[in-house]
């Protein structure tokens, strides 16, 4: 009874299509598959960024796989052929591993790359990224930002750079169509006549870095003798109401009364007849139903009621004050 053997896939390689971290892993079928013509061969692929403790594992019948990587580090991958038990009289057969690596040859020392990269997607409309120049780089150093996400034919360069002393220190992005809920890849590279500049790579999802506009149209409504309803509206823009969480800060007679987090555009407050002044502010953030993370908006303008008996069952007058 001869032992069944199978060869590893051929020509296993990692291909960089220029998408700033989104790479193709591809291979060819193993040699000598003639004995297994009736069989559907599978491949077990393992890959990771060098330095990561865990491998990602994929089992596929295809001859390629695509995923995102951190190009600040190297990438290692290995693959072997699997013959399912149906082909081998009851036991799965695996080939030896074929292995490959990929890395971008780093230019320049790490200190020359951009520092403190910060990106915010304002109101789910306007993406702005800013950075500081590398440590010890000269004023002749300039940085260029490129970005890519699935849907673009190729990586694009920043349209509107923000400058300081002639150096690019940020980017205002153009309209980004169908760019959320997918990985967004950025590379900031640099050039200098004096020394090579290290490139930096960043990956995030836009919906997770949204900073909304603050809520607007804050009002008070008397609900009962001991309850006041605070109401506000979502700001103008593309973020639907279902995506907001709110934090309210309420001050009663100059002392902090309540800080609360709510999901709706209303909050009912218990009051006493002694209350002479009531002020509140609200801020918003994209909630867990629409993103994994987010940034609180600025606080709204402060809305106050003062000078009348709060126990009156009326729609209360309100004045604008700045928080």
């Amino acid at each position: 009874d001869t032992e069944i053997k199978v060869n590893p896939p051929q020509d296993f390689e990692i291909v960089d299509p220029g998408y700033l971290g989104y790479l193709y892993l591809q291979w060819q079928p193993p040699l000598s598959l003639d004995h297994f013509k009736e069989c559907t061969v599978e491949y077990e692929l393992k890959y990771r960024n060098i330095g990561s403790e865990t491998w990602k594992t994929i089992i596929t019948k295809n001859l390629h796989y695509k995923d995102g990587f951190d190009l600040n580090k190297g990438i290692e991958a290995k693959i072997h052929t699997l013959l399912p038990w149906q082909c081998t009289n009851g036991s799965e057969v695996q080939s030896s591993w074929a292995e490959t690596t990929y890395w971008i040859s780093p230019q320049g020392i790490p200190e020359t790359k951009v520092q403190d990269m910060d990106c915010v997607y304002y109101n789910w409309q306007y993406l702005l990224c800013s950075w500081k120049p590398g440590i010890g780089v000269l004023l002749d150093t300039n940085y260029n930002l490129f970005y890519w996400y699935e849907g673009l034919d190729h990586a694009l360069q920043c349209v509107d750079y923000i400058k300081a002393d002639g150096q690019n220190i940020g980017c205002r992005f153009p309209y980004l169509e169908a760019s959320d809920y997918k990985d967004f890849y950025i590379c900031v590279n640099g050039s200098s006549e004096n020394k090579p500049i290290r490139s930096s790579y960043f990956t995030f999802q836009l919906q997770n870095i949204v900073k909304p506009l603050p809520p607007v149209y804050l009002t008070f409504t008397r609900e009962s003798s001991c309850e006041i309803k605070l109401k506000w509206s979502i700001p103008l823009g593309p973020i639907p109401a279902r995506c907001f969480d709110y934090e309210i800060e309420i001050r009663e007679d100059d002392t902090t009364l309540v800080t609360a987090t709510v999901e709706n555009e209303t909050y009912t407050l218990k009051t006493t007849n002694e209350t002479r002044q009531l002020c509140f502010v609200v801020r918003s953030k994209v909630n867990i139903y629409c993103s994994d993370d987010g940034i609180w908006s600025e606080w709204s303008d402060k809305q106050c009621w003062e000078g009348e008996d709060l126990s009156k069952k009326t729609l209360l007058r309100h004045h604008h004050h700045h928080h």
Epitope: Y122, Q125, Y126, L128, D153, L156, Q157, V159, D160, I162, K163, A164, I169, G170, R172, F173, P174, Y175, L213, E298
Partner: antibody, heavy 119, light 111 residues
Framework: QVQLVQSGAEVKKPGASVKVSCKAS????????MNWVRQAPGQGLEWMGR????????DYNQNFKDRVTITRDTSASTAYMELSSLRSEDTAVYYC????????????WGQGTSVTVSS | EIVLTQSPATLSLSPGERATLSCRAS??????????MNWYQQKPGQAPRLLIY???RQGSGIPDRFSGSGSGTDFTLTISRLEPEDFAVYFC?????????FGGGTKLEIK
């Protein structure tokens, strides 16, 4: 909520200078470019220049041949446009106008400041 | 500088009709895969209002009857069904390169 409030109308003599202010509120001033556009009576629109409040970077329309100076005070969320060596053809309404970047156009405009140059 | 030519200078139509306004640039206003062409509406005594940016993107709060199209040097603003409040002057503007320039305007008047 976004508001651009400009200073009041001005009447100036030829050769004088005028400085128009534009106070921004309802948004983060430094995140958006501030443009200046003018419109002579019954005429079209003419872009004068823009400032990036984030870093102070400025682009001018060279047609104004060094007569225009655009500045900003980020702490006051205010942009300024000064036009010198005024002549009668500078009589126009001057607008400040906010735009996020070159691909977004100009989405909010001030109410306009009328400048009349007359001897 | 890039010169923008709008046509017609005046367009006389009735409410409910379709309006097609044209803007031609002296050179391409495309770059980075974007058409840097914007459209504005202006009514007497008022500041302009952004209708369309990047050739075809609707400005905030702009009704769906306004649409933009085109690339390179030829651009069109279409108002699918004219409302009484749409009769105004319309300007195209390029933001590809400094100095930003405006077209001479098309006056849309009631027939």
């Amino acid at each position: 909520q976004v508001q651009l409030v400009q200073s009041g109308a001005e009447v100036k003599k030829p050769g004088a200078s005028v400085k128009v202010s534009c106070k921004a509120s309802g948004y983060t001033f430094s995140n958006y470019l501030m443009n200046w556009v003018r419109q002579a009576p019954g005429q079209g629109l003419e872009w004068m220049g823009r400032i990036d409040p984030y870093d102070g970077d400025i682009d001018y329309n060279q047609n104004f041949k060094d007569r225009v100076t655009i500045t900003r005070d980020t702490s006051a969320s205010t942009a300024y446009m000064e036009l010198s060596s005024l002549r009668s053809e500078d009589t126009a309404v001057y607008y400040c106008a906010r735009g996020y970047g070159t691909a977004y156009g100009v989405d909010y405009w001030g109410q306009g400041t009328s400048v009349t140059v007359s001897s | 500088e890039i010169v923008l030519t709008q046509s017609p200078a005046t367009l006389s139509l009735s409410p409910g009709e379709r309006a097609t306004l044209s803007c031609r640039a002296s050179e391409s206003v495309d770059n980075y895969g974007i058409s840097f062409m914007n459209w504005y509406q202006q009514k007497p005594g008022q500041a302009p209002r952004l209708l369309i940016y990047a050739a075809s993107r609707q400005g905030s709060g702009i009704p769906d009857r306004f649409s933009g199209s085109g690339s390179g040097t030829d651009f069109t603003l279409t108002i699918s069904r004219l409302e009484p409040e749409d009769f105004a002057v319309y300007f195209c503007q390029q933001s590809k390169e400094v100095p930003w320039t405006f077209g001479g305007g098309t006056k849309l008047e009631i027939k």
